[in-house]
Amino acid sequence: EPHSLRYNLTVLSWDGSVQSGFLAEVHLDGQPFLRYDRQKCRAKPQGQWAEDVLGNKTWDRETRDLTGNGKDLRMTLAHIKDQKEGLHSLQEIRVCEIHEDNSTRSSQHFYYDGELFLSQNLETEEWTVPQSSRAQTLAMNVRNFLKEDAMKTKTHYHAMHADCLQELRRYLESGVVLRRTVPPMVNVTRSEASEGNITVTCRASSFYPRNIILTWRQDGVSLSHDTQQWGDVLPDGNGTYQTWVATRICRGEEQRFTCYMEHSGNHSTHPVPSGKVLVLQSHWQHHHHHHGLNDIFEAQKIEWHE
């Protein structure tokens, strides 16, 4: 997977008046890395590994960049004409990537009230606008303002592209991101399924990087794909990832099944617990919104199985 740096800024308006603050998060390689602390007006690292990336250097540069970006985005929101009464948001997501072959990609996306209305490839400067008439109107509004603003010239977009990549390279130079491995915690649980069957679930959590093999084996042989159900590999909010795999087996055959895990060159096998085990089973539903705002994980029900 490519290395990536992702800036996510949001500004708000109320009854047509742009609010003074802004929300900002920065993700490094898909992990929460920086957050703008509105109380202290400073960029703050998210967790120990983020602090380790810069070592003893200060976060002044990041604070300055985020503050400047927030100010630009507030000005952009002020120029959006169709602001009706009530609360509205303008969100900018900027991403740059360095791929294994050293090629780079950079893009910028604008969302109004959670709806994508304008994208730009920062390398080719090519703009993309969704088909809807609302998006077309918003995009015209914003593009006109950006053209008027002397700061938003051709060189500005090249600079945004270059700055993002420069920061990404600076973070990667520390070696913390490249070297970082956190082994998963693996947990196997069982729950009642239909008569004579049980569902066995293998969960891997708190691991980094995100690449992992998690599969059920029967007698040491991997079960076919269609007999297993996999969860997505998702961030768990601590700078690490989580995932799961489940399958249905016949009661009494538990000893034949093991969960096999492989991560960052290490592997392990985990048997199915025998007997009656008390299992807290959470059913998580993943709502995927394409507006770039936070994904929602909704705990639908929690059941005790005995």
């Epitope: 084996r217 007698d219 040491g220 042989v221 055959e253 592997h267 048997p271």
Partner: antibody
């Protein structure tokens, strides 16, 4: 490449016991199960049991419970099968085998001939 | 235990001839759990076909497998001298794993 090298032939007296070894190389030993199979002279194959080298967990053919004990030594990447209270019925070639994760007995050792005779 | 019955027990074929060996299970098994092995005289068994129809690494394309439920077969498209061996089917569906009694293939 994956190789399973078994210990040499054994001639043992009835009532005695024997330990057959199977040294694995060419792959991460704890990644895949080791299976044991018996082949009596001129006969078919019989599965004895298997062991997961990572955690030592075993699954055995009921017929060989009490007869065969499966163990591993992770430090030397070696699996062992201990056969006790030997009788002439136990005279056979014993094979160890391992998997590639997709089929049961993908790779086989060369076999160990155990002869029980007074 | 699942009993696997192979037929024929022995057979002789001429080079170039098409060979079919059958394996009948005493109870139904999923095709994912049926494998075939070849054992040449004085050697260890060798995996030939796994999961009913998948050729193991290095196995010539003249070998093929098919079947479902209780009835499975191994086919050699054109018999060659080096195919002289005993062939075993094996099930991994239920414990204990069992092997067929073997089919000894000779050359005419």
């Amino acid at each position: 490449q994956v190789q399973l090298k078994q210990s040499g032939p054994e001639l043992v007296k009835p009532g005695a016991s024997v330990k057959v070894s199977c040294k694995a190389s060419g792959y991460a030993f704890t990644k895949y199960n080791i299976y044991w199979v018996k082949q009596s002279h001129g006969k078919s194959l019989e599965w004895i049991g298997y062991i997961d080298p990572y955690n030592g967990g075993t699954v055995q053919n009921q017929k060989f419970k009490g007869k065969a004990t499966l163990t591993v030594d992770k430090s030397s990447s070696t699996a062992y099968m201990h056969l006790n209270s030997l009788t002439s019925e136990d005279s056979a070639v014993y094979y160890c085998a391992t998997t590639d994760g997709y089929s049961l007995f993908t790779y086989w050792g060369q076999g160990t001939l155990v002869t029980v005779s007074s | 235990d699942i009993v696997l019955t192979q037929s024929p027990t022995t057979m002789a074929a001429s080079p170039g001839e098409k060979i079919t060996i059958t394996c009948s299970a005493s109870s139904s098994i999923s095709s994912n759990y049926l494998h075939w092995y070849q054992q040449k005289p004085g050697f260890s068994p060798k995996l030939l076909i796994y999961r009913t129809s998948n050729l193991a690494s290095g196995v010539p394309a003249r070998f093929s497998g098919s079947g479902s439920g209780t009835s499975y077969s191994l086919t050699i498209g054109t018999m060659e001298a080096e195919d002289v061996a005993t062939y075993y089917c094996q099930q991994g569906s239920s414990i204990p794993f069992t092997f067929g009694s073997g089919t000894k293939l000779e050359i005419k």
